[in-house]
């Protein structure tokens, strides 16, 4: 069966300066390929986190994505600012040249509250 990307939260609210977790789980690790988090959709979407060797300030993975059986690709965003508001999508790709997007989660909207 086709892999599903599940984002259970429709939205989260977080005070500026605090941290928040955006949950994402997969039903399978197949086909082989990366998982990436984006804010927004379409050509203007912004890469927020990639489960690779890249470093992303203020964004970390919640569980150990290097473990072979791990299906949890949740992320934690620290020191949230008003600019972090928006809808975040967890996206599964199939490895290739280039990688091909095959499934996206339903999106989680982040609301940033004034401290």
């Amino acid at each position: 069966t086709e892999v599903k990307v599940i984002q259970p939260e429709k939205s989260v609210s977080v005070a500026a300066g605090d941290s928040t977790v955006l949950n994402c789980t997969l039903t399978s690790l197949l086909p082989v390929g990366p998982i990436r988090w984006y804010r927004g959709v379409g050509q203007s979407r912004q890469l927020i986190y990639s489960f690779t060797t890249e470093h992303f300030p203020r964004v970390t993975n919640v569980s150990d994505a290097t473990k072979r059986s791990n299906l949890d690709f949740s992320i934690r965003i620290s020191n949230v600012t008003p600019e972090d508001a928006g809808t975040y999508y967890c996206v599964k790709f199939q490895r290739g040249s280039p990688d091909t997007e095959i499934q996206s989660g339903g999106g989680t909207e982040v609301y940033v509250l004034a401290k």
Partner: antibody, heavy 119, light 108 residues
């Protein structure tokens, strides 16, 4: 106080159509996703359809896909379910249910309206 | 589609007794599970969400527990108004949202 009031139910022949309405009050209707859930006589609950607050996102159960259409009019605080090609197995009490703002469980329910499909 | 199986189908107990209702998911739903109570001729009412959090106005004799695939709703001491049908619902996966088949708690 949140109120959801369904209307439009009744007896209809197989193959015919019916439109249900759900009038909402007591909350900012356009900010919430709302659903139709049905319950056949003496049976359990069955999710039917979902529409997001803006109306942009819609889902249907496989059992009604292609026959039922969910819609909303945020200016009237009203949810609709257009039911076409009705079958005997669509006989049920139809509830509208307001989702929690963060998760897809149901905070509030209407009292339901009975749809009977019979010749 | 995630399938929820409730057991037993019917629970026959006396007022004051403890009721334990089970809901099993066909795959993990983590703690994204809700419980509802439905009395004859009435709409369902939310009791528990997040597997263990009581909804507003729900008495503390109702408690939920579990995670993953096994969940329990416990009514510590049955009151006359608690005799009803109880449904679980998962909201982990995006639609279709699914309910369990229900457990009827009836008076002995």
């Amino acid at each position: 106080e949140v109120q959801l009031v369904e209307s439009g139910g009744g007896v209809v022949q197989p193959g015919r159509s019916l439109r249900l309405s759900c009038a909402a009050s007591g909350f900012t209707f356009s900010s919430y996703d709302v659903n139709w859930v049905r319950q056949a006589p003496g049976k359990g609950l069955e999710w039917v359809s979902l529409i997001s607050g803006s109306g942009e996102i819609i889902y249907y159960a496989d059992s009604v896909k292609g026959r039922f259409t969910i819609s909303r009019d945020n200016s009237k605080n009203t949810l609709y379910l257009q039911m076409n090609s009705l079958r005997a197995e669509d006989t049920a009490v139809y509830y509208c249910a307001k989702e929690n703002n963060r998760y897809r469980f149901f905070d509030d329910w209407g009292q339901g309206t009975l749809v009977t499909v019979s010749s | 589609e995630i399938v929820l199986t409730q057991s037993p189908g019917t629970l026959t107990l006396s007022p004051g007794e403890r009721a334990t209702l089970s809901c099993r998911a066909s795959q993990s739903v983590y703690t994204y599970l809700a419980w509802y109570q439905q009395k004859p001729g009435q709409a369902p009412r939310l009791l528990i969400y997040g597997a263990s959090s009581r909804a507003t106005g729900i008495p503390d004799r109702f408690s939920g527990s579990g995670s993953g695939t096994e969940f329990t709703l416990t009514i510590s001491s049955l009151q006359s108004e608690d005799f009803a049908v109880y449904y679980c619902q998962q909201y982990y996966d995006r639609p279709p949202l699914t309910f369990g088949g229900g457990t009827k708690v009836e008076i002995k």
